[in-house]
């Protein structure tokens, strides 16, 4: 297993609709053919997998149909979007990148992006 540097923003604020986007960039010494990207959430010393996608370079990322993640790639940059976030989902979201093919296997783990989610205030009742 070879180590690889992964960069991601330190902080992102989710939109009022519970959507957060960030770029995960990996520094590889060459072009992989098959890449796996996993988003992990760390909160209260617990780490859980949020979503994962394996893609062929030059093709779109394909997450599972029921995934809360979507993404696109350009070169070594992966643009990740996480949807359906609520205040309780605030936490550190870590980008993990694996170069699956060709060998040898490279692994890189980012320092994490702290995503802050603020639930919108409910609309006040209206007489109209």
């Amino acid at each position: 297993c070879k180590a690889m540097h992964v960069a991601q923003p330190a902080v992102v604020l989710a939109s009022s609709r519970g959507i957060a986007s960030f770029v995960c960039e990996y520094a590889s010494p060459g072009k992989a053919t098959e890449v796996r990207v996993t988003v992990l959430r760390q909160a209260d010393s617990q780490v859980t997998e949020v979503c994962a996608a394996t893609y062929m370079m030059g093709n779109e990322l394909t997450f599972l149909d029921d995934s809360i993640c979507t993404g696109t790639s350009s070169g070594n940059q992966v643009n990740l979007t996480i949807q359906g976030l609520r205040a309780m989902d605030t936490g550190l979201y870590i980008c993990k990148v694996e170069l699956m093919y060709p060998p040898p296997y490279y692994l890189g783990i980012g320092n994490g992006t702290q995503i802050y989610v603020i639930d919108p205030e409910p609309c006040p009742d209206s007489d109209f």
């Epitope: 520094a27 590889s28 060459g30 070594n76």
Partner: antibody
Framework: DVQLQESGPGLVKPSQSLSLTCSVT?????????WNWIRQFPGNKLEWMGH????????YNPSLINRISITRDTSKFLQFFLKLSSVTTEDTATYFC????????????WGQGTSVTVSS | DIQMTQSPSSLSASLGGKVTITCKAS??????IGWYQHKPGKGPRLLIY???TLQPGIPSRFSGSGSGRDYSLSIRNLEPEDIATYYC?????????FGSGTKLEIK
């Protein structure tokens, strides 16, 4: 540590074939990476010639496609080879072998190079 | 093929000083660039890959930057052992192509 070492004749006659060997120590060429030949002309210009992958697939520089062949030793997987046919004086250069990750990449290990002169 | 236009072809600098070498690609190479140091009688030595990532064992005096078509290598606190020829190489597309080289001399 990984080491690469080129070897072959230092003098080749025009119209003949040039054959070079790259011996690899510290890594089996079937375990990964792409294994390249690069040459440096007398004016210092570097030219990528081609490579062979860990699983034996080739890519060549289009400028050499009709004259070049890169193969590997299939018994111990510790050597790969360059054959360049119909050489001319323009093929006089220092020839390097090197490896890179992925279908295209930056070369992290190089041999020290071997000088080849094409002359009658 | 992607052309890599490297400049200057040579430069002279003082010990302890700083130099910058540039490479311009004929198209966007999406940060897929490596930089090498080459000394006579040896193979080139990889300094930096993916624009700015230092190869293990390379001192932090070396740094790289750029995006799109424009890239640069900087060396600060120049030392006598930095005397060499430096090359850029793109790895966005085959065939792999190199810059023409920059010969660094110390004043």
């Amino acid at each position: 540590d990984v080491q690469l070492q080129e070897s072959g004749p230092g003098l080749v006659k025009p119209s003949q074939s040039l054959s070079l060997t790259c011996s690899v120590t510290g890594y089996s060429i079937t375990s990964g990476f792409y294994w390249n030949w690069i040459r440096q002309f007398p004016g210092n210009k570097l030219e990528w010639m081609g490579h062979i992958s860990h699983d034996g697939r080739n890519n060549y520089n289009p400028s050499l496609i009709n004259r070049i062949s890169i193969t590997r030793d299939t018994s111990k997987f510790l050597q790969f080879f360059l054959k360049l046919s119909s050489v001319t004086t323009e093929d006089t250069a220092t020839y390097f072998c090197a490896r890179h990750y992925g279908s295209s990449g930056a070369m992290d290990y190089w041999g020290q190079g071997t000088s080849v002169t094409v002359s009658s | 093929d992607i052309q890599m236009t490297q400049s200057p072809s040579s430069l002279s600098a003082s010990l302890g000083g700083k130099v910058t070498i540039t490479c311009k690609a004929s198209q966007d190479i999406k940060k897929y660039i490596g930089w090498y140091q080459h000394k006579p009688g040896k193979g080139p030595r990889l300094l930096i890959y993916y624009t700015s990532t230092l190869q293990p064992g390379i001192p932090s005096r070396f740094s790289g930057s750029g995006s799109g078509r424009d890239y640069s290598l900087s060396i600060r606190n120049l030392e006598p052992e930095d005397i060499a020829t430096y090359y850029c190489q793109q790895y966005d597309n085959l065939p792999l192509t190199f810059g023409s080289g920059t010969k660094l001399e110390i004043k």
